[in-house]
Interface confidence: medium
């Protein structure tokens, strides 16, 4: 069965100065590859976090990602302020060369 | 050949707002992006926001944000990009530009208007 | 926000020569979402190269992009009158930024 990638909570209600988790989970550990978060979808999306590489000081993930089988991919963004607001998108990349590929969206 | 026409040139006041028109011709206009820059007399390219008419919301740029509203209207084919509160510094020539299919990534900008000259002057 | 920084500022070439403009970015692109662009004085700009190295429709083959990750490389081979003008890198990895241009003159 392909990859799904499952984001549970239509929205999160998070006040000034807490902490948002921002949950999802991948149905399968195929295709290989990282998870990125993103604000907003399509032209002019903001890159929020890349499993990776990259310096996210605001963001912290769930669970351990460098292990090998594991399916979750919720991350956690602190102190939010008003400007925060939007829809966010787990992004499921695979693997490429030279670069990785978009493969599905939650 | 997917063509973008832009409104005419515009001279506004301090603390108006400006809205300019971006009508596509010659190729399917919902499903793909229609991106705003603008580019200050002497300066670069600078972005301002995105919309996919078939999704209709827009992304802006988080210097324009609040600012700017980028809206489409499918059944002619046009987007709008209107700007508040003007100051002397937008001053400048604004320009549509088509990106990639809604369905895919490939957001780089592959047709571009001719551009609107808006001159912000008391 | 992903800064793109270009260089040199400006370049002084003779038609016949080999220009290479360098773009560098703040933190790692994919090279997917990598495009250059050339402007001329009172035109809009021209769409050259997008994902890094492929050709836009109808852009000649002297034009050329290649690099990844926060090192991308527009050359122009060999280079023709019409070719001197403003070029401008962009990511669409994370929103959308420009670099600042580089603007390439007759020697």
């Known amino acids: 069965e392909e990859l799904q990638v499952i984001q549970p909570d239509k929205s999160v209600l998070v006040a000034a100065g807490e902490t948002a988790t921002l949950r999802c989970t991948a149905t399968s550990l195929i295709p290989v590859g990282p998870i990125q978060w993103f604000r907003g979808a399509g032209p002019g999306r903001e890159l929020i976090y890349n499993q990776k590489e990259g310096h996210f000081p605001r963001v912290t993930t769930v669970s351990d990602l460098t292990k090998r089988n594991n399916m979750d991919f919720s991350i956690r963004i602190g102190n939010i302020t008003p400007a925060d607001a939007g829809t966010y998108y787990c992004v499921k990349f695979r693997k490429g060369s030279p670069d990785d590929v978009e493969f599905k969206s939650g | 050949q997917v063509q973008l026409v832009q409104s005419g040139a515009e001279v506004k006041k301090p603390g108006s707002s400006v809205k300019v028109s971006c009508k596509a011709s010659?190729?399917?206009?919902?499903?793909?992006?229609i991106s705003w820059v603008r580019q200050a007399p002497g300066q670069g390219l600078e972005w301002m926001g995105s919309i996919i008419p078939i999704f209709g919301t827009a992304n802006y740029a988080q210097k324009f944000q609040g600012r700017v509203t980028i809206t489409a209207d499918e059944s002619t084919s046009t987007a709008y990009m209107e700007l508040s509160s003007l100051r002397s510094e937008d001053t400048a020539v604004y320009y549509c530009a088509r990106g990639g299919y809604a369905a895919g990534t490939d957001y780089y900008m592959g047709v571009w208007g001719k551009g609107t000259t808006v001159t912000v002057s008391s | 926000e992903i800064v793109l920084t270009q260089s040199p500022g400006t370049l002084s070439l003779s038609p016949g020569e080999r220009a290479t403009l360098s773009c560098r970015a703040s933190?790692?692109?994919?090279?997917?979402?990598l495009a250059w662009y050339q402007q001329k004085p009172g035109q809009a700009p021209r769409l050259l190269i997008y994902?890094?190295?492929s050709r836009a429709t109808g852009i000649p083959d002297r034009f050329s992009g290649s690099g990844s990750g926060t090192d991308f490389t527009l050359t122009i081979s060999r280079l023709e009158p019409e070719d001197f003008a403003v070029y401008y890198c962009?990511?669409?990895?994370?929103?959308?930024?420009f670099g600042g241009g580089t603007k390439v003159e007759i020697k």
């Open positions: 962009q990511q669409y990895y994370s929103s959308y930024t």
């Open positions: 994902g890094a190295s």
């Open positions: 010659g190729g399917t206009f919902s499903s793909y992006a």
């Open positions: 933190q790692s692109v994919s090279s997917s979402y």
